[in-house]
């Protein structure tokens, strides 16, 4: 079996404000069994924007249902965007553990660039 | 950490209806499957249903198909398993199991409930 | 329905000896690359506890003596030096399709 591997295909998304960015990512494997979580930024400081596992996150909806059978695919929508969602966003897998998840590998980033609406 | 609890022992009449709860804590209760196992006095495990919160699609075991229905509350984070015209060998400790790889498979088990039918 | 069948139906060995229960299913269990088997221990009193998961693979905390192997059909739960704490009955479960398990494996020591 093959390691697997964190997939985000977009380098850079570019998004009007107020409109909704669409942040993609796959994973190559159903192991190991964990949730995925996302983030702004990278290192201790990095942002929690959506938690597979636990959490509420009202901007956010996964585009795949994550309970089906199989799923690889944990892209997500933001809503509302706005010129502070601006960022690098990471896709990270994490490893079920006891009693915590254990992270285990990370996407390559999406850079978030917002477009200002035009007055 | 993910916690099942499951409602109490129960005594029941033969052709008399049960329903045992399951809470679910620790995680995002719409974001995984739900299995119900039992288990007979000395016997192994049998399993009866699977329920996804999320949509509540269920999957049932042809032998409990017409006398089982699974429910959730997601405002409570409970899962239900109804069980109608209980008969003696109905008796057994019924378990709430829940999928955290979306594989089918039961990662984390309530403590069960004992439910026992005689006359 | 797959049919799991497990062998032997009870089984003694002796304290830091290997122990090996097979699983055999009716029809292949293998789909996607994937081998939907998982194996459980149950201790008395105690819920089962996910030991392995899609045939081979440790599940978290899960001491590394054991291991699962096997595809297709023909599964095999090994404990490599069996503990005093091991003694429990021990699951196969399928989700090839919907779920079944095996009827059981009582391991105790010799």
């Known amino acids: 079996e093959e390691e697997l591997q964190v997939i985000q295909p977009d380098k850079s998304v570019l998004v009007a404000a107020g409109e909704t960015a669409t942040l993609r990512c796959t994973v190559t494997s159903l192991i190991p069994v964990g949730p995925i979580q996302w983030f702004r930024g990278a290192g201790p400081g990095r942002e929690l924007i959506y938690n597979q596992k636990e959490g509420h996150f009202p901007r956010v909806t996964t585009v795949s249902d994550s309970t089906k059978r199989n799923n690889m695919d944990f892209s997500i929508r933001i809503g509302n965007i706005t010129p502070a969602d601006a960022g690098t966003y990471y896709c990270v897998k994490f490893r079920k553990g006891s009693p915590d998840d254990v992270e285990f590998k990370s996407g390559a980033g999406t850079e978030l660039s917002v477009r200002a609406k035009p007055s | 950490q993910v916690q099942l609890v499951q409602s109490g022992a129960e005594v029941k009449k033969p052709g008399a209806s049960v329903k045992v709860s399951c809470k679910a804590s620790g995680y995002t209760f719409t974001n995984y499957w739900i299995n119900w196992v039992r288990q007979a006095p000395g016997q192994g495990l049998e399993w009866i249903a699977m329920i996804d919160p999320s949509d509540s699609e269920t999957h049932y075991n042809q032998i409990f198909k017409d006398r089982a229905t699974l429910t959730t509350d997601t405002s409570t984070s409970t899962a239900y398993m109804e069980l109608r015209s209980l008969r003696s060998d109905d008796t057994a400790v019924y378990y709430c199991?829940?999928?955290?790889?979306?594989?089918?498979?039961?990662?984390?088990w309530g403590r069960g409930t004992l439910v026992t039918v005689s006359s | 329905d797959i049919v799991l069948t497990q062998s032997p139906d009870s089984l003694a060995v002796s304290l830091g000896e290997r122990a090996t229960i097979n699983c055999r299913a009716s029809?292949?269990?293998?789909?996607?690359?994937?081998?939907?088997i998982f194996w459980y221990q149950q201790k008395p009193g105690q819920p089962p506890k996910l030991l392995i998961y899609l045939a081979s693979n440790l599940d978290s905390g899960v001491p590394d003596r054991f291991s699962g192997s096997g595809s297709g059909t023909d599964f095999t739960l090994t404990i490599s030096s069996l503990q005093a704490e091991d003694v429990a009955v021990y699951y196969c479960q399928h989700s090839r399709d919907l779920p079944t398990f095996g009827q059981g494996t009582k391991l105790e020591i010799k």
């Open positions: 029809k292949s269990v293998s789909s996607s690359g994937y081998n939907y």
């Open positions: 199991a829940m999928d955290y790889g979306s594989l089918y498979a039961m990662d984390y």
